[in-house]
């Protein structure tokens, strides 16, 4: 598989980590999250051309079949390979609590 | 998250397991796999509308941000949640070997 910088479609166009700034209102969290007021959401965005960051054998198969049957089989998709934890300060019935979410921020990406 | 049958876009249009019949030639495996000659490839195909089979918090965030910034943030993507193992009989330098691949056939799907 090609490495993350070797995008055949041009620099930065293939599957990689992006940061999107989002407020609690954007996320629909304003009524239950106190802090942070704004989240730097890291997510996986970009194209998955042939064998680029292929996660596994399934992704390789998907690439082959997409080439043969593009109307039936979609190209692999850019998704998180792992996550970074994030702490949210939440409102509770009794006050405030700290909650760690392990599946909120993408850490790195692959195609599947 | 809605269950797998409750697709708001119409029956069978949302993220679910599909089977695609593929020959070794289709997969580009003809020179190293002896058997099976044909593979029933199970893969995840379909749309991921709002909160449908959302895999985790990240998927929920992605849905929210896609609604706000559809040109920047893609909708969640239908990918395997788990896999079924598959045995391939391969040609090796010394003869023939059995190899079990744990990441070849999708077992069930979710949106991420």
């Amino acid at each position: 598989a090609r490495n993350g910088d070797d995008c055949p479609l041009g620099p930065g166009r293939c599957c990689r980590l992006h940061t999107v700034r989002a407020s609690l209102e954007d996320l629909g969290w304003a009524d239950w999250v106190l802090s942070p007021r704004e989240v730097q959401v890291t997510m996986c965005i970009g194209a998955c051309p042939s064998q680029f960051r292929a996660a596994n054998m399934h992704a390789q198969i998907k690439t082959s079949l997409h080439r043969l049957k593009p109307d039936t089989v979609p190209a692999p998709c850019c998704v998180p390979a792992s996550y970074n934890p994030m702490v949210l300060i939440q409102k509770t019935d009794t006050g405030v609590s700290l909650q760690t979410y392990d599946d909120l921020l993408a850490k790195d990406c692959h195609c599947i | 998250a809605r269950n797998g049958d409750d697709c708001p876009l119409g029956p069978g249009r949302c993220c679910r397991l599909h089977t695609v019949r593929a020959s070794l030639e289709d997969l580009g495996w003809a020179d190293w796999v002896l058997s099976p000659r044909e593979v029933q490839v199970t893969m995840c195909i379909g749309a991921c509308p709002s909160q449908f089979r959302a895999a985790n918090m990240h998927a929920q965030i992605k849905t929210s941000l896609h609604r706000l910034k559809p040109d920047t943030v893609p909708a969640p993507c239908c990918v395997p949640a788990s896999y079924n193992p598959m045995v391939l009989i391969q040609k090796t330098d010394t003869g023939v070997s059995l190899q079990t691949y744990d990441d070849l056939l999708a077992k069930d799907c979710h949106c991420i």
Partner: antibody, heavy 119, light 111 residues
Framework: DVKLVESGEGLVKPGGSLKLSCAAS????????MSWVRQTPEKRLEWVAY????????YYADTVKGRFTISRDNARNTLYLQMSSLKSEDTAMYYC????????????WGQGTTLTVSS | DSVLTQSPASLLVSLGQRATISCRAS??????????MHWYQQKPGQPPKLLIK???YLESGVPARFSGSGSGTDFTLNIHPVEEEDAATYYC?????????FGGGTKLEIK
């Protein structure tokens, strides 16, 4: 060690039914396809039925189609062959075999179980 | 269906000599890459045992005196030098497509 142990042998009248079982051990049963192969009294080998690892692909020899049903229980590591409308020509030694995948070979065989169809 | 015809039906070979068994398919059991023909040995009171897979690949643990060759419709099993323990019936089998079929068998006797 891979072991396949058949059971269910019997003497059955023509038109009768019988179910054969095969208990598998020593390998990950759910990862492999399985087949039944029979050997006639004249020592001819005949492939009878095939079932894929997950049970979703099933094939039969024309001689048994519509009369025999192959199935498996991966939780119990057991292969089955339900036989009905039995004929005298079904008389044979029935072997449970590991067939690996489609287009493969039989790498392990059980010791066999005998079916006799006679009035 | 591909019908497999084995010849000879029986074979008497001297110890240390070569035994050659033929298997002919009524239609090709090969692709451009591989041949889907396999060979088994069966001794009295025992189930068949795999010897050769995909026409020429020796199964693990099988002595090197066994060899297989051929493609398309014509296949051969060779045993050289023949040993006493090789007395058995030999079967070919194809798996190119369903239904899988076996040859009628060749009984090898050693003198």
């Amino acid at each position: 060690d891979v072991k396949l142990v058949e059971s269910g042998e019997g003497l059955v009248k023509p038109g009768g039914s019988l179910k054969l079982s095969c208990a598998a051990s020593g390998f990950t049963f759910s990862s492999y396809a399985m087949s039944w192969v029979r050997q006639t009294p004249e020592k001819r080998l005949e492939w009878v039925a095939y079932i894929s690892s997950g049970g979703d692909n099933i094939y039969y020899a024309d001689t048994v189609k519509g009369r025999f049903t192959i199935s498996r229980d991966n939780a119990r590591n057991t292969l089955y062959l339900q036989m009905s409308s039995l004929k005298s020509e079904d008389t044979a030694m029935y072997y449970c075999t590991r067939a690996l995948v489609e287009n493969a070979y039989f790498d392990y065989w059980g010791q066999g179980t005998t079916l006799t169809v006679s009035s | 269906d591909s019908v497999l015809t084995q010849s000879p039906a029986s074979l008497l070979v001297s110890l240390g000599q070569r035994a050659t068994i033929s298997c002919r398919a009524s239609k090709s059991v090969s692709t451009s890459t591989y041949s889907y023909m396999h060979w088994y040995q069966q001794k009295p009171g025992q189930p068949p045992k795999l010897l050769i897979k995909y026409a020429s690949y020796l199964e693990s643990g099988v002595p090197a005196r066994f060899s297989g060759s051929g493609s398309g419709t014509d296949f051969t099993l060779n045993i050289h030098p023949v040993e006493e323990e090789d007395a058995a019936t030999y079967y070919c089998q194809h798996s190119r497509e369903f239904p899988w079929t076996f040859g009628g068998g060749t009984k090898l006797e050693i003198k």
